[in-house]
Interface confidence: low
């Protein structure tokens, strides 16, 4: 029952002698598993026996009998789905029909597959796109209706026998739908590939040649052109004739139109392969090419540079750069249209020829003010000498020159004077626009370049000015030489180095920081009394009476300056001690008597000691000795001693008389 057997496999398989054939195959037997399989070669149905006759290439039966062909022919299928076969190697006489005789428990089926085995490896087939254009990527396909697991092959692409550099992608198909090997090559053909032979070569696994297919490339491209010119160097003089010829070296398809271009612009009414230029002018110099078009597009030849030669035109001068800064470098360029280029130049400065300058450029490495002026040139080539053009002006700029600071006042200048200075210069380009002064001060500038210093200071030593245009030029500083009275006068003790004690030798110095003029006189004074006219005041043996307030004065021709008062202090031991008594040296008993120890001392007495008429020290140490109530027994002579850091002094005896009171006398 045919409806129960469904087969899928390629209709025809292709191979060659010695290769192999792999037959992908699937089937479906709906009534159960396969029980018997026989592979026939060219089976014929025998009506008498109701069986198929033919060569049995493979047999699989219940009893397991297998012919010797089994080694070459393999059934790789199973009992219900797969009916794949392999013949390895395959022979020429295997061509024809293969019959797959399938039997299940209740059903039988004969499936036929065509096998085409050639004597030699058959060639692959190259497939090209319908149109190939230069520089457009195309895919070349090489297809071979063969693939077999037991017989590896490779497809190689060659261009004129040279392996193509581009990487090819090879794919194989061994399916029930198709069996093939395919190589695809992506390739961007150039116009020069037109007409070239591309080969797809079939090789075995070792790279041995088996067969090939070749095609000739038909690459559509714009016309490829050659331009020829007479004269061949394309160099002519005004009035000469020029002929240009355009040759098409390749065009696919054939060209349709021709045109000529000069400097990229189409020339009207020039539509032949020859361009004739008669009596050329210099304006016809330029780049010429021919353009030929076909259906792909326009193709252009290389450019021919036509040079029409003529004598130099009136020249102009270009200055790099004007205005120029003194000391910088300047380049002059003589510009003159000429063909050929000028070979000799003559240069002029303010109308006078510049000796030794024959180049297109004049380079002055260090510009000076005298270089300013008009520069012009004349160019010369083999066809003649040009005319001198209008020239160009060089402006040389420089800072103000010979700047000086001038004092306008009569000399000498005294502290407190008003001083006027002016800033002068010799020349400047551009003009001076401002002035600067050093050092800076809150000074007046009544007019440009004039400085007025009111109440000039003693320490205004030097002033410098700068005259400025784009740059500032500074003058050398000018000394004001301001005269002033001596400054910072002060008294300084030279000796002794420590405090002054009575009897010491003492020297005082009159110091000052500065004086202009330098010649000075000194004066020493104490309480308005002149003491000396030297810079030093000396005491051989100082006494306490010399203590006091001292000043020194220093004079010059401008004025006199006094020091601050300086206090001279003399240290001495207590002296001129005496004991004074209060209310007197005669006191009535019972009253109070106060004895005071008076002295002269520097520093003041720090410690007192009291003694009686027996030279016995009393237990009292203050300046005052208070007796209260006073007794008759207190009568007697007393003296005191004073002590300071310098020494001690004692008083003479003083007598206290204590007399009886009337009450005491009354009781007696």
């Amino acid at each position: 029952d045919s409806s129960k057997w469904v087969f899928e496999h390629p209709e025809t398989l292709y191979a060659w002698e010695g290769a192999c054939v792999w037959i992908p195959c699937t089937y479906r037997a709906l009534d159960g598993d396969l029980e018997s399989f026989i592979l026939f070669h060219n089976p014929e149905y025998n009506k008498n026996t109701s069986k198929f006759d033919g060569t049995r290439l493979y047999e699989s039966t219940k009893d397991g009998k297998v012919p010797s062909e089994q080694k070459r022919v393999q059934f790789l299928g199973d009992k219900n789905k797969n009916c794949t076969l392999s013949i390895h190697p395959v022979h020429l006489n295997d061509s024809g029909q293969l019959g797959l005789r399938m039997e299940s428990k209740t059903e039988k089926w004969m499936e036929r597959i065509h096998l085409n085995v050639s004597e030699r490896p058959f060639p692959p087939h190259i497939q090209l796109p319908p149109e190939i254009q230069e520089s457009q990527e195309v895919t070349l396909t090489c297809l071979l209706n063969f693939s077999c697991y037991g017989y590896p092959i490779q497809l190689q692409w060659l261009l004129e026998g040279v392996p193509m550099r581009q990487a090819a992608v090879t794919s194989t198909s061994l399916t029930i739908k198709s069996v093939f090997t395919r190589s695809e090559l992506k390739f961007s053909p150039q116009w020069s590939h037109h007409g070239k032979i591309v080969t797809c070569q079939l090789q075995d696994a070792d790279g041995k040649f088996l067969s090939n297919d070749t095609v000739q490339l038909n690459v559509k491209h714009t016309p490829k052109l050659e331009i020829k010119v007479t004269p061949s160097d394309a160099i002519v003089r005004e009035g000469d004739s020029v002929t240009m010829t355009c040759e098409v070296s390749s065009s696919n398809p054939e060209y349709t139109t021709v045109s000529w271009l000069k400097d990229g612009t189409s020339l009207k009414k020039q539509n032949t392969f020859t361009l004739n230029l008669r009596e050329v002018t210099k304006d016809q110099s330029g780049k010429y090419c021919c353009q030929v078009s076909n259906d792909v597009g326009p193709g252009r030849s290389e450019e021919v540079f036509l040079q029409v030669q003529y004598a130099p035109e009136p020249s102009t001068v270009q200055i790099l750069h004007s205005p120029a800064v003194e000391g910088s470098q300047v380049e002059f360029l003589c510009m003159s249209l000429a063909n050929p280029l000028p070979t000799n130049y003559t240069w002029y400065h303010n109308g006078k020829e510049m000796q030794g300058r024959t180049e297109e450029k004049v380079h002055i490495p260090k510009i000076l003010p005298w270089h300013a002026g008009t520069y012009s040139c004349v160019a010369e080539n083999i066809l003649g000498t040009g005319q001198r053009g209008p020239g160009a002006e060089l402006d040389v700029q420089y800072p103000p020159k010979k700047v000086t600071t001038v004092i306008q006042n009569p000399m000498p200048i005294r502290e407190g004077d008003t001083v006027t200075l002016s800033c002068n210069y010799n020349s400047s380009n551009p003009s001076v626009t401002r002035y600067e002064w050093k050092p800076h001060g809150a000074w007046e500038e009544p007019s440009l370049g004039v400085l007025k210093i009111q109440n000039v200071g003693w320490d205004n030593t030097t002033i410098a000015c700068a005259a400025c245009n784009s740059w500032c030029s500074w003058a050398s500083p000018v000394a004001l030489n301001v005269q002033y009275a001596p400054r910072d006068v002060r008294v300084r003790k030279i000796k002794p180095l420590s405090e002054i004690h009575s009897g010491n030798s003492v020297s005082l110095q009159c110091d000052f920081s500065s004086s202009h003029p330098k010649e000075v006189q000194f004066f020493w004074e104490k309480n308005g009394r002149l003491l000396g006219k030297e810079s030093q005041l000396n005491f051989d043996s100082i006494s306490p009476e010399d203590a006091g307030s001292y000043s020194c004065w220093v004079n010059n021709s401008i004025g006199q300056t006094a020091s601050k008062a300086w206090t001279l202090e003399v240290l001495y031991a207590p002296r001129r001690l005496r004991v004074s008594m209060s209310p007197g040296d005669q006191v009535m008993e019972g009253k109070s008597a106060t004895l005071t120890c008076e002295s002269d001392a520097n520093p003041p007495v720090s410690h007192y000691t009291w003694f009686d008429w027996n030279n016995q020290s009393l237990p009292y140490h203050s300046q005052k000795l208070r007796l209260e109530p006073v007794k008759v027994q207190h009568s007697g002579a007393y003296w005191c001693q004073g002590t300071n850091s310098v020494g001690k002094g004692r008083s003479p005896l003083s007598t206290l008389t204590v007399y009886y009171s009337p009450e005491t006398i009354g009781r007696r």
């Epitope: 004129e160 026998g161 040279v162 020069s192 037109h194 007409g195 070239k196 032979i197 490829k224 050659e226 040759e247 070296s249 390749s250 696919n252």
Partner: nanobody, 114 residues
Framework: QVQLVESGGGLVQAGGSLRLSCAAS????????MAWYRQAPGKQRERVGV????????TDAASVQGRFTISRDNAKNTVYLQMNSLKPEDTAVYYC???????WGQGTQVTVSS
């Protein structure tokens, strides 16, 4: 247009040698791959060998391998075919041309007698 002029053919005995020359006009000669072809009476024109534009690569048909050598001189716009160990089956009119072909020249007759 470009012109191709072949020369150097003649009658030679089997085993002998000949050197064919092909002069090409046109400034693009040095850009072109050049090929030598031959056509025997009653047969299709077959390609004998190819040389690329700078002369660095050549390929020959299986029938002439090891016997024929192609070379070129771009300064002279000329391509050469050195033929050694000639056989009677090499008898043909020999042509040179570019790839792709320019208009064909007249060719030069080579006859190899046994």
């Amino acid at each position: 247009q470009v012109q191709l002029v072949e020369s150097g053919g003649g009658l030679v005995q089997a085993g002998g040698s000949l050197r064919l020359s092909c002069a090409a006009s046109g400034s693009t000669f040095s850009l072109k791959a050049m090929a030598w072809y031959r056509q025997a009476p009653g047969k299709q024109r077959e390609r004998v060998g190819v040389i690329n534009s700078d002369g660095s690569y050549t390929t020959d048909a299986a029938s002439v391998q090891g016997r024929f050598t192609i070379s070129r001189d771009n300064a002279k716009n000329t391509v050469y075919l050195q033929m050694n160990s000639l056989k009677p089956e090499d008898t043909a009119v020999y042509y040179c041309n570019t790839m792709p072909p320019w208009p064909w020249g007249q060719g030069t007759q080579v006859t190899v007698s046994s």
